[in-house]
C-alpha cells in the first residue's frame, strides 16, 4: 500500500528512520 505505514517497523523516534513515510491522512485533505 503506497504511502502507508503498513510495512514500517515501530521505531522509538525519528533518529533511526531511513526514509520519510507519508501515511495517507484523509483528515488533512481539503
Amino acid at each position: 500500500k503506497i504511502g502507508s505505514t503498513e510495512n514500517l517497523k515501530h521505531q522509538p523516534g525519528g533518529g533511526k528512520v531511513q526514509i520519510v513515510y507519508k501515511p495517507v491522512d484523509l483528515s488533512k485533505v481539503t
Epitope: T5, G15, V20, Y21
Partner: antibody, heavy 120, light 112 residues
Framework: QVQLQQSGPELVKPGTSVKMPCKAS????????ISWVKQRTGQGLEWIGE????????YYNEKFKGKATLTADKSSNTAYMQLSSVTSEDSAVYFC?????????????WGQGTSVTVSS | DIVMSQSPSSLAVSAGEKVTMSCKSS????????????LAWYQQKPGQSPKLLIY???TRESGVPDRFTGSGSGTDFTLTISSVQAEDLAVYYC????????FGGGTKLDIK
Amino acid sequence: QVQLQQSGPELVKPGTSVKMPCKASGYIFTDYVISWVKQRTGQGLEWIGEIFPRSGSTYYNEKFKGKATLTADKSSNTAYMQLSSVTSEDSAVYFCARDYYGTSFAMDYWGQGTSVTVSS
Amino acid sequence: DIVMSQSPSSLAVSAGEKVTMSCKSSQSLLNSRTRKNYLAWYQQKPGQSPKLLIYWASTRESGVPDRFTGSGSGTDFTLTISSVQAEDLAVYYCKQSFYLRTFGGGTKLDIK
C-alpha cells in the same frame, strides 16, 4: 475529522489502579501511534509512553515503567492507559495524542485530557 | 536520555512585539538520512490541550498563522512570533522525537 475522546474525571483511592480510555475516530487507527502525556497542576508536559495499535508494540519513558501500562483495542479504535498502585504523585491530567508516526513524529491531534485525583 | 532545556521560563511583551524563545537539546536531533530535525513546538493555552505549531524544527502545521516561525538545527532551536497577538498568551513547549519523546520545561508568554 480526527477526534480523540477521553473520559471524565476520576477519583481513585491510593494503592488502587485506574484505567482510562482514548477513543479515536476520523482516521485509520492502526496507521498512527498513540502517545500519552502527563501534566500535573501548574506544571509542564511529561511523556509517558506510546503504543502502535497495529502491532501492540510499546515504548515507555523509563520513569513510568511499572506504573503505566498501554494497550489498544483495534476493534473499538480505543487506546487505554492503566496506572497501578496510585499515589498522590499520580494526581494529574493525562492526555492522549495521535503521533504522526513515520513522518514528523509529532503529536498533531490531542484528546481533551482525563483528570485523575488520588485521594482516600 | 535526551534532555530538553527551554529559555526563558517566562516573558511578557506588548501586542505587536516580536518574541523569540530558545530550546536546546543535549544531543543532536538531526537525522542525516532524512535530513530532518525531530523537534516540534506546541502551544498550550490556559485550560486547553496542547496544540502542534511546528514540526521538523521549521515546518508549520496546517492552519497555524505565519507569524509563528521555527528555526535551528542540531541542538539549538528557536521559536519566533513576529508580531504577538493577545490570543498568543500561552505556554510554549519544545519536544524532541529523535529518540522516544522529551518535552522542554516550557516558556510562559504573557501579554502586557
